[in-house]
């Protein structure tokens, strides 16, 4: 299931202690996502059929509206805050894609499965990032921004927005995995 649209309100009172070696776990989750990002991208554009597989640059280029910035040379705190925003953006966008694909490509079960598995890792990553921000920097809430809502778009636009998002996801997750 997709990430909740509104992140849980946190008061920076951690009910459970953060996981041991939290930064290592964050790195591991990013590596996991990076390792499967290209396969997810290929699975997606293949499932959409023509004209997607032969027009990747045009239809699946990573030009995404209002995507949160990331500065790899920032402090740990700044990178974690920016990572959190990116994960929320990706998570909600992935939720939209999953919803659309279940209707547009109901038989693409391996795609649905991979989208759900990615969303699960993103959820765990989100929890770990907030735990780190809370325990080390006293930041219990990060204000976020969301991607474009695909409901109300036509079939082609839904497929294209999804492909662009996954192209961006593949690109940014490599940067994030390297930065941490």
């Amino acid at each position: 299931s997709p990430l909740p649209i509104t992140p849980v309100n946190a008061t920076c009172a951690i009910r459970h202690p953060c996981h041991n070696n939290l930064m290592n776990q964050i790195r591991s989750q990013l590596a996991q996502l990076n390792g499967s990002a290209n396969a997810l991208f290929i699975l997606y554009y293949t499932a959409q059929g023509e004209p997607f597989p032969n027009n990747l640059d045009k239809l699946c280029g990573p030009n995404v509206t209002d995507f949160p910035p990331f500065h790899a040379n920032g402090t740990e705190k700044a990178k974690l805050v920016e990572l959190y925003r990116i994960v929320v953006y990706l998570g909600t966008s992935l939720g939209n894609i999953t919803r659309d694909q279940k209707i547009l490509n109901p038989s693409a079960l391996s795609l649905h499965s991979k989208l759900n598995a990615t969303a699960d890792i993103l959820r765990g990553l989100l929890s770990n990032v907030l735990c780190r921000l809370c325990s080390k920097y006293h930041v219990g809430h990060v204000d976020v921004t969301y991607g474009p809502d695909t409901s109300g778009k036509d079939v082609f636009q839904k497929k294209k927005l999804g492909c662009q998002l996954l192209g961006k996801y593949k690109q940014i997750i490599a940067v994030l995995a390297q930065a941490f």
């Epitope: 509104t6 309100n9 949160p68 910035p69 805050v81 219990g140 809430h141 204000d143």
Partner: antibody
Framework: EQLEESVGDLVKPGASLTLTCTAS?????????MCWVRQAPGKGLEWIAC????????TYYATWAKGRFTISKTSSTTVTLQMTSLTVADTATYFC?????????????WGPGTLVTVSS | ELVMTQTPASVSEPVGGTVTINCQAS??????LVWYQQKSGQPPKLLIY???MLASGVPSRFKGSGSGTQFTLTISDLECADGATYYC??????????????FGGGTE
């Protein structure tokens, strides 16, 4: 990149007033906190409110400002501060400021300020 | 509610000297602290962010340090142009309804 507050006013106690902050050289598609800070004559700085420019439009207020002050994003380059039930104690220079999206960033960009005088 | 206490309220030092301004937070704020300089009739100017990071265009004579509840701004090799009021400020969102955004009382 610049911020400019609308011209302040002389108003009577109990009156309402809306201040506007206009950004130039940038828009709110960047992720910032747009905030209002005031300074009574000869006194220190006092935070009033902030609004997040991301799609959630989250708002935050100083405890004393809740209920009487309202911050709003009215376009991709303007933020307003509505003030009601004004008292003499609200006489101050009101500054609009842009805060960074990361904790500890602070306000790197300020408007020149506008004087609001509340007097009978 | 968080209180930021700044000391001293005023300080005077000769040109070339060094000044130290202290800021104490009533609770642990990690490194989420900012320092500003304000001259008469002007808006404040950001000097230091994240407790110790020098803002763009600020000379290295200005140094911020500290973490948790105790913070210091040190200005060395004082110049006449440094005559101003200095403010510390906490800056972070502690929860979805609480932006910790308080200023110290200022040091002239």
């Amino acid at each position: 990149e610049q911020l400019e507050e609308s011209v302040g006013d002389l108003v009577k106690p109990g009156a309402s007033l809306t201040l506007t902050c206009t950004a130039s050289g940038f828009s709110f598609s960047g992720l910032y906190y747009m905030c209002w800070v005031r300074q009574a004559p000869g006194k220190g700085l006092e935070w009033i409110a902030c609004i997040w420019t991301g799609s959630t439009d989250s708002t935050y207020y100083a405890t004393w400002a809740k209920g009487r002050f309202t911050i709003s994003k009215t376009s991709s380059t303007t933020v307003t501060l509505q003030m009601t039930s004004l008292t003499v104690a609200d006489t101050a220079t009101y500054f609009c400021a842009r805060g960074g999206g990361v904790p500890g960033d602070g306000y790197a960009l300020w408007g020149p300020g506008t004087l609001v005088t509340v007097s009978s | 509610e968080l209180v930021m206490t700044q000391t001293p309220a005023s300080v005077s030092e000769p040109v070339g000297g060094t000044v130290t301004i202290n800021c104490q937070a009533s609770e642990d704020i990690s490194s989420n602290l900012v320092w500003y300089q304000q001259k008469s009739g002007q808006p404040p100017k950001l000097l230091i962010y994240d407790a110790s990071m020098l803002a763009s265009g600020v000379p290295s004579r200005f140094k911020g340090s500290g973490s948790g509840t105790q913070f210091t701004l040190t200005i060395s090799d004082l110049e006449c142009a440094d005559g101003a009021t200095y403010y510390c400020q906490s800056y972070y969102v502690a929860s979805s309804s609480y932006f910790v955004n308080g200023f110290g009382g200022g040091t002239e």
